[in-house]
């Protein structure tokens, strides 16, 4: 009993601590840790039925998808998959959890966001954090040196997400990657082309793709006087420049990460620059940067990349941005990130600050990490941030009060009189067998008005009405729900007529 009282007191104290930290706007990591402690204390306390009412909800950072949301999602996926297939990609799938060892050491500072699973009989497992590391493991395991693949699946991150801005702990990623030894920058350019094609097709607003190169970053840090051990941590500070001012980034680098102020200032001179191919040319003339082998390689490749992007007709969408320093450890070359410049300004709609909607880069060393002999398979890829896109599309449709169909039913089989259930069942079965998407109401004697109303609500375009007279005449009354126009169609012609009216191919081959 004393044990329970002590635990209850600790839960109370820990709860107060968490609230205090939130009020003080303490670091996200500290709050996350203290919240995790609170949850562990509560778990030890166990349920006290007299006090605790179980709240029915999805776990933090997750959500259910309603039929309406799923309809949006499927449309978005359709655009993406069609583009991936147009570019000749195969599709793969991998397990939702991996051996913990597979994921360790691949994500740098982000490793703390990996979900570890409780021990399930000896294997230490973690939920996948992205689709790239599992892809690299797949290549190494199957000794593949050449593949162009896409993979659409859920990934998991122990983030503290702002769900209103399309950020979750469980979310979909849509990845496209090209693995293999090819001439420089051709696959990289295609990845950027794919990114632009998809974002343009989705019509979610104007966007810009920021491009940089890990080698330029590393070279720049080296000439500015950053020690090797600090490269990655300084990268993560620089990457915040799209969200906060240079002063704040500098303070973090100097105050929290121990960088000398003059080194930070030298970095600042570079990372605040962005432009096009002219900036690449300018930096190739930079007396210090051009002396650095890594940076020079990176700049040379970027120059070539811009040539290809011009040929692909997308150079106007690309900006060379020296502050882009994506937070994942595995990038080795070109890196890129697409951001929305603004969401469509619909009447009465709040502008959405959803930031990055796609990203990617070159990661030539990742497969080698899994190969016993360290054999490298060069890879480049991209990931579409579909959750953010879903949020934008959903909000836009809500603002437009647009009706979204959540089913694809083409026709409702209805009856105008009683005692025609058997006939309706026979007809709906004929339609299903012919590949028509059809429904009927699950009532013996539904009122015609109710059946028509159901079509209005569900957006079903056609009603096939059976009546006693129609049965005698061997016809079916086909009614258009929107125009209310009715025509008698011979029963043997019904399938063809429905297909004609709904634009479905006549053969389901």
């Amino acid at each position: 009993m004393a044990e329970r009282a002590a635990l209850e007191e600790l839960v109370k104290l820990q709860g107060e601590r968490v609230r205090g930290l939130k009020q003080q706007k303490a670091s996200a990591e500290l709050i996350e840790e203290e919240v995790a402690k609170l949850l562990k204390l509560k778990a030890q306390l166990g349920p006290d039925e007299s006090k605790q009412k179980f709240v029915l909800k999805t776990p933090k950072g997750t959500r259910d998808y309603s039929p309406r949301q799923m309809a949006v999602r499927e449309k978005v996926f359709d655009v993406i998959i069609r583009c991936f297939k147009r570019h000749g990609a195969e599709v793969i799938d991998t397990p939702v959890f991996e051996l913990k060892e597979t994921l360790m050491g691949k994500y740098g500072e982000d490793s703390k966001l990996i979900y570890d699973l409780k021990d399930q009989g000896g294997e230490l497992l973690s939920l996948r954090y992205d689709l790239t590391v599992p892809f690299a493991r797949y290549l190494a395991m199957n000794k593949l040196t050449n593949i162009k693949r896409y993979h659409i699946a859920k990934v998991y991150r122990r983030d503290n997400p702002a769900m209103t801005r399309g950020r979750y702990r469980e979310f979909y990623q849509c990845d496209f990657d090209i693995a293999g030894n090819f001439d420089p920058m051709i696959p990289d350019a295609e990845c950027l082309k794919i990114m632009c094609e998809i974002l343009s097709s989705l019509q979610i607003g104007d966007f810009l793709v920021k491009v940089n190169d890990r080698r330029i970053l590393d070279g720049m840090f080296a000439i500015c006087g950053v020690s090797d051990s600090k490269f990655r941590t300084i990268c993560s500070s620089v990457d915040k420049l799209d969200k906060v001012s240079w002063e704040e980034v500098k303070n973090e680098m100097v105050g929290e990460k121990g960088l000398a102020p003059e080194v930070a200032d030298r970095i600042g001179d570079y990372v605040q620059q962005h432009g096009g191919v002219s900036l690449v040319e300018q930096l190739l003339q930079d007396p210090k940067l051009s002396q650095n082998k890594q940076a020079l390689e990176g700049l040379g490749d970027l120059k070539l990349l811009f040539e290809y992007l011009t040929l692909f007709g997308i150079d106007d969408k690309i900006s060379f941005d020296l502050s882009l320093a994506r937070g994942l450890d595995y990038y080795t070359g070109v890196i890129y990130e697409a951001v929305l410049l603004q969401t469509p300004a619909q009447a009465g709609e709040e502008p959405l600050g959803v930031g990055s909607v796609a990203a990617g880069g070159r990661y030539d060393g990742l497969v080698g990490m899994f190969d016993p002999k360290g054999r490298k398979v060069p890879c480049v890829g991209l990931s579409i941030g579909v959750e953010r896109i879903f949020s934008i599309v959903e909000q836009r449709l809500e603002a437009l009060e647009e009706k979204i169909r959540t089913t694809e039913t083409q026709v409702l089989v209805a009856s105008a009189q009683k005692k025609l259930l058997e006939e309706r069942l026979k007809l709906v079965s004929e339609l299903w067998d012919a590949g028509i998407k059809a429904e009927l109401l699950y009532k013996k004697n539904p009122k015609l008005l109710n059946q028509l109303q159901y079509c209005e609500e569900a957006g079903i375009p056609l009603v096939a009405i059976i009546g006693e007279q129609e049965l005698k005449d061997g016809v079916i009354k086909l009614r258009s729900v929107t125009s209310r126009e009715e025509v008698d169609v011979r029963r043997e012609d019904l399938v063809e007529e429905i297909k004609r009216r709904t634009g479905q191919p006549l053969c389901i081959c």
Epitope: L10, R17, L41, Q44, D119
Partner: antibody, heavy 120, light 107 residues
């Protein structure tokens, strides 16, 4: 019953390295935050570092940050402290300690300690 | 960092005496305080946690009180095995800090 047994201490020259280990038994090691606490000869106690149950979180006192690394292997029920660039002021008995109620930063169970002497 | 100051640094008392040791934090720590007992050549032993909760197996003559910045450990009737050094420790924020210790000696 809960047992924590430290090992790996000894005499080392300034600038040298040592790796301390702590073997845990008698409880579900992977459920608990663990820590290293030290006590210089004839002096008070100093909390050196801690590590969370899953190794997600680690912290170090200022005087050892960048030189010491705490780690754990839940499969082996073991806690470690890698000590590099050792200084004379690191001389102390190092205790491995288990948190109270898994996550409360109060040392409920302690090992017997292992002596680290840094001297030229 | 939060500083913990214990007083007195040493105290002489006899078996059967009532002894009070105080601990002051340099800033408020709510009830995040523990008391430990340490005997020469041994590891410390937890007595009290979150200011006033007696650790299981610890005799009831030990008690703790206080919150915020001022805390006390009281031994109601000293026993021969109680002569040792006592430390307070704050568990409010890292680095978790201990008081300098109070040595309880036989008069």
């Amino acid at each position: 019953q809960v047992q924590l047994v430290e090992s790996g201490g000894g005499l080392v020259k300034p600038g040298g390295s040592l790796r301390l280990s702590c073997a845990a038994s008698g409880f579900t090691f992977s459920d608990y935050y663990m820590s290293w606490i030290r006590q210089a000869p004839g002096k008070g106690l100093e909390w050196v570092s801690y590590i969370s149950d899953s190794s997600r979180y680690t912290k170090y006192t200022d005087s050892v940050r960048g030189r010491f690394t705490i780690s754990r292997d839940n499969a082996k029920n073991s806690l470690y402290l890698q000590m590099n660039s050792l200084r004379a002021e690191d001389t102390a008995v190092y205790y491995c300690a288990r948190y109270l109620y898994q996550v409360i930063a109060i040392a409920k169970s302690w090992g017997q300690g292992t002596l680290v002497t840094v001297s030229s | 960092d939060i500083q913990m100051t214990q007083s007195p640094s040493s105290v002489s008392a006899s078996v059967g005496d009532r002894v009070t040791i105080t601990c002051r934090a340099s800033q408020g720590i709510s009830s995040w305080l523990a008391w430990f007992q340490q005997k020469p050549g041994k590891a410390p032993k937890l007595l009290i946690f979150v200011a006033s909760n007696l650790e299981s197996g610890v005799p009831s003559r030990f008690s703790g009180s206080g919150s915020g910045t001022d805390f006390t450990l009281t031994i109601s009737s000293l026993q021969p095995e109680d002569f040792a050094t006592y430390y307070c420790q704050q568990a409010e924020s890292f680095p978790y800090t201990f008081g300098q210790g109070t040595k309880l000696e036989i008069k």
